[in-house]
């Protein structure tokens, strides 16, 4: 069945980087974009950026530009989100979401990955 | 950036009653060429990822009960739950995809 499975929770020190993975199964990833959205405790959902899984083109929200890198490995059917220069405010649950070409909504989500930034 | 404003922040409704959530965008989400409003509604329960309910402002995702409906165009949108069920207690988010992506602040729906 169609699903996105994310890597496990991470605890990181301020200034470090974190790389979260999102493994797709049950569909051809090249037909989709993968988006990353985060949610800090008790806060609204915040869009970070996306990757076109066909050609690896990326677009990032201005807020994260320079700090976030989204990549993909088609042979492993996996997308990755790496966030660098972590600070305490980056403590959040990070989600991947699938977006089909020309549809503009997330019909399948990963289960979420909690990233805690603490010294 | 397009700013999405939801109201109210929270809503207490009796079981079987109607719940109405509003979402306002800082600019029109209607693409005149395609005739579509690029607005979606998601439901999120504690400890779970969001779940797609409505896309293109009024199209219900498959498997979503017909008590959920979306309406509106341009800058003003509404999610309606016609008869609230216990399992509908959650936070509801609107999201625009007209230009990049922005979510509203969320509306918490609880039982009165």
């Amino acid at each position: 069945q169609v699903q996105l499975v994310q890597s496990g929770a991470e605890v990181k020190k301020p200034g470090a980087s974190v790389k979260v993975s999102c493994k797709a199964s049950g569909f051809n990833i090249k037909d989709y974009y993968m988006h990353w959205v985060r949610q800090a405790p008790g806060q609204r959902l915040e869009w970070m950026g996306w990757i076109d899984l066909e050609n690896a083109n990326t677009i990032y929200d201005a807020k994260f530009q320079g700090r976030v890198t989204i990549t993909r490995d088609t042979s492993a059917s996996t997308a990755y989100m790496e966030l660098s220069s972590l600070r305490s405010e980056d403590t959040a649950v990070y989600y991947c979401g699938r977006d089909a070409y020309g549809r503009y909504f997330y019909d399948v989500w990963g289960q979420g990955t909690l990233v805690t930034v603490s010294s | 950036d397009i700013v999405m404003t939801q109201s109210p922040d929270s809503l207490a409704v009796s079981l079987g009653e109607r719940a109405t959530i509003n979402c306002k965008s800082s600019q029109s989400l209607l693409n005149a060429r395609t005739g579509k409003n690029y607005l979606a509604w998601y439901q999120q329960k504690p400890g779970q990822p969001p779940k797609l309910l409505i896309y293109w402002a009024s199209t219900r995702e498959s498997g979503v009960p017909d008590r959920f409906s979306g309406s509106g165009s341009g800058t003003d949108f509404t999610l309606t739950i016609s008869s609230l069920q216990a399992e509908d207690v959650a936070v509801y988010y609107c999201k625009q995809s007209y230009s990049l992506r922005t979510f509203g602040g969320g509306t918490k729906v609880e039982i009165k």
Epitope: E54, N57, G102 | N31, K36, Y38
Partner: antibody, heavy 127, light 107 residues
């Protein structure tokens, strides 16, 4: 109402390059897509690539990758298509049209079908 | 790449008759992303139908589009003299492609 006016016919030698222009009037040029489509004599239509000026980057059909360059100048509301390493099979009418695939993943730029079209530019490749 | 196959290659009909043109895709195409164009000799193509069934501005209602998935149809309910032309279907997904065209000629 958007109107597209293309540059005039060109005769080129094999191995050279050609650059065709497409000037838009009406509408907001930066936010809509422009595609280039060609039609060889007596043949069908073939999409070459497209650009959304506000984003600046173009996308190309696999067949033309590396040989075609599509650009846009927002200040003059003009799109350009340059095709290099010309060969006789490139003899065709080249059209620009409003619309292109939405590689930018935002609904506001969903502009896929092609309407209107420029009048076409005949490019003849001959030694 | 999605291949669109149009049939028939040529359709010979009299004015007043109904024309039915077929377009078959090698894989499923979203209805939102299928269009039909008319092209007359020496002219640029002209958009007739988008989204499989929506008529473009100014297109007479004798032109209609239908279909979904891999099978799409353009119907001209009563041919007028000005309708004799070549018709192309197009899918505008990630990499747009056109069908080979159907020539509608006078019998």
């Amino acid at each position: 109402q958007v109107q597209l006016v293309q540059s005039g016919a060109e005769v080129k030698k094999p191995g050279s390059s050609v650059k065709v222009s497409c000037k838009a009037s009406g509408g907001t040029f930066s936010s809509y897509a422009i595609s280039w489509v060609r039609q060889a004599p007596g043949q069908g239509l073939e999409w070459m690539g497209g650009i959304i000026p506000i984003f600046g980057t173009a996308n190309y059909a696999q067949k033309f990758q590396g040989r075609v360059t599509i650009t846009a100048d927002e200040s003059t509301s003009t799109a350009y298509m340059e095709l290099s390493s010309l060969r006789s099979e490139d003899t065709a009418v080249y059209y620009c049209a409003r619309g292109a695939p939405n590689y930018y993943g935002s609904g506001g730029y969903d502009d896929g079908w092609f309407d209107p079209w420029g009048q076409g530019t005949l490019v003849t490749v001959s030694s | 790449e999605i291949v669109l196959t149009q049939s028939p290659g040529t359709l010979s009909l009299s004015p007043g008759e109904r024309a039915t043109l077929s377009c078959r895709a090698s894989q499923s195409v979203s209805s939102s992303y299928l269009a039909w164009y008319q092209q007359k000799p020496g002219q640029a193509p002209r958009l007739l139908i988008y989204g499989a069934s929506s008529r473009a501005t100014g297109i007479p209602d004798r032109f209609s589009g239908s279909g979904s998935g891999t099978d799409f149809t353009l119907t001209i309910s009563r041919l007028e003299p000005e309708d004799f032309a070549v018709y192309y279907c197009q899918q505008f997904g990630r990499f747009p492609t056109f069908g080979g065209g159907t020539k509608v000629e006078i019998k």
